[in-house]
């Protein structure tokens, strides 16, 4: 009796962070014995799609012409083969943005600062929202995701980081997005600049809890420091 | 063209069971996912149960789990629904409907068989 | 458990625009829902208009879509014809389960 069938690797290209009305196209890679690969959303009621292998048959394309709210969320994929179905993928997430205008990203008291003392980014959102991401330009993940106690909405959320060191410096951008939906996202903010300068370097922060990556030291989130923020939203970690 | 046909209902006495059958024909059953839907006298429409098109995935309404069973045979083209213990508000006409290939490509419920009438009393 | 509640009937004149709703009691329907339209003529026979990721079902004219206003889903006629009157149902999927609306009789005045 052979074992379960290895499972299939499943990727998003250009990436899985994607503006509405844009193309996306979802990779299924299985093995060369593949008959059909399939698509499976979460919480669908049926598969959501079903291609037949590209040759030399060991994997296939899913495409999305044009991206809406409809494909925004997690999916699997998996292959049928003469014995069956394989294991499922890992999960994709296929985040869409531009569902909500976009958020004003500053930084208080000012995006030019000394390193050693305390910077806060503060994201705010014309309408009433419950989750706040904070990205910076290169990193491998959102570096910070605020959501609001018990669905309540806000209008704005504090990134603080404190102490600043040379390594905070870089482009940063948010986004805003309601609960219902964590593959809905806003518009991207304008982006900042945060100028770190002086020589007052310290230690590297140390992130309140880790995640882990496959980048480069450079690329490692950067987790803020600091107490609630005064939005009354509370650090909810992916 | 596609043809749904319910058969097996009739009278059965409250807690005795029916097993219903929807031949399908017309279409390749086996690339499509089914449903059971039921209309009681003078009601709406009630969906019961899903299953998908190799019958991975099945999903009931709590008023019937753990009573009624969805199944298929796709060498035989037939989709069924096992009812057990029945209950007198299960009367109704109860038919079968096509779901879709996948989400991208088709609509659920597109075609119906004519229904076949259940009527539970004692 | 969800309640789907539809117009109980609306009446409509040939070439007249008419559309109708479908509400959730759990609140504002979404595309996670993939609200379906039935139409169902006399004698019982139902047919699939509009779901899945809105697609149209083969032979279904133009006239008929499907959207989300608000906070329901609606079917939109556009220049209704004496033909469309039936009984509409919309189901609305809730993460295991469908759940069917009481439908809304349409009358097209002749």
């Known amino acids: 009796q052979a074992g379960p069938l290895p499972k299939p690797t499943l990727w998003a290209e250009p990436g899985s962070v994607i503006s509405w009305g844009n193309s996306v196209t979802i990779w299924c890679q299985g093995t060369l014995e593949a008959r059909e690969y399939r698509l499976d959303k979460e919480e669908s009621p049926a598969p959501w799609d079903r291609q037949n292998p590209l040759e030399p048959k060991n994997k296939a394309r899913f495409s999305i012409p044009s991206m809406t709210e409809d494909y925004a969320g997690r999916y699997r994929c998996y292959y049928r083969s003469p014995v069956g179905w394989s294991q499922p993928s890992d999960p994709l997430e296929l985040v869409m943005t531009g569902a909500y205008s976009k958020p004003t990203l500053s930084a208080l008291p000012s995006p030019l600062v000394t390193s050693g003392k305390s910077v806060t980014l503060l994201c705010q959102s014309r309408s009433p929202m419950d989750t706040f991401l904070l990205i910076k330009e290169r990193a491998a993940h959102p570096l910070l995701h605020l959501r609001s106690e018990h669905g309540a909405q806000q209008h704005q959320a504090e990134f603080p980081m404190s102490p600043v060191t040379s390594v905070h410096g870089g482009t940063y951008r948010c986004f805003s997005s309601h609960g219902f939906s964590h593959y809905l996202l806003s518009h991207p903010s304008d982006p900042l600049e945060l100028i770190v300068s002086g020589s007052l370097e310290g230690p590297r922060p140390s992130p309140t809890r880790s995640v882990s990556t496959a980048a480069g030291p450079e690329d490692q989130p950067l987790m803020p420091t600091g107490s609630v923020p005064h939005s009354g939203l509370r650090r909810h970690w992916e | 063209q596609v043809q749904l046909v319910e058969s097996g209902g009739g009278v059965v006495q409250p807690g005795r069971s029916l097993r219903l059958s929807c031949a399908a024909s017309g279409f390749t059953f086996s690339n499509y996912g089914m449903h059971w839907v039921r209309q009681a006298p003078g009601k709406g429409l009630e969906w019961m149960a899903g299953i998908w098109f190799d019958g991975t995935n099945k999903y009931y309404i709590d008023s019937v789990k753990g009573r009624f069973t969805i199944s298929r045979d796709n060498s035989k083209n037939t989709l069924y629904l096992q009812m057990n213990n029945l209950r007198a508000e299960d009367t109704a006409v109860y038919y079968c409907?096509?779901?879709?290939?996948?989400?991208?490509?088709?609509?659920?419920?597109?075609?119906w068989g004519q229904g076949t009438l259940v009527t539970v009393s004692s | 458990d969800a309640v789907v509640t539809q117009e109980s009937a609306l009446t409509t004149s040939p070439g007249e625009t008419v559309t109708l709703t479908c509400r959730s009691s759990t609140g504002a329907v979404t595309t996670s829902n993939y609200a379906n339209w039935v139409q169902e003529k006399p004698d019982h026979l139902f047919t699939g208009l509009i779901g899945?990721?809105?697609n149209r079902a083969p032979g279904v004219p133009a006239r008929f879509s499907g959207s989300l206003i608000g906070d329901k889903a609606a079917l939109t006629i556009t220049g209704a014809q004496t033909e469309d009157e039936a009984i509409y149902f919309c189901a609305l999927w809730y993460s295991n389960h469908w759940v069917f609306g009481g439908g809304t009789k349409l009358t097209v005045l002749g």
């Open positions: 899945g990721i809105n």
């Open positions: 409907a096509r779901d879709v290939i996948s989400m991208v490509r088709g609509v659920p419920f597109d075609y």
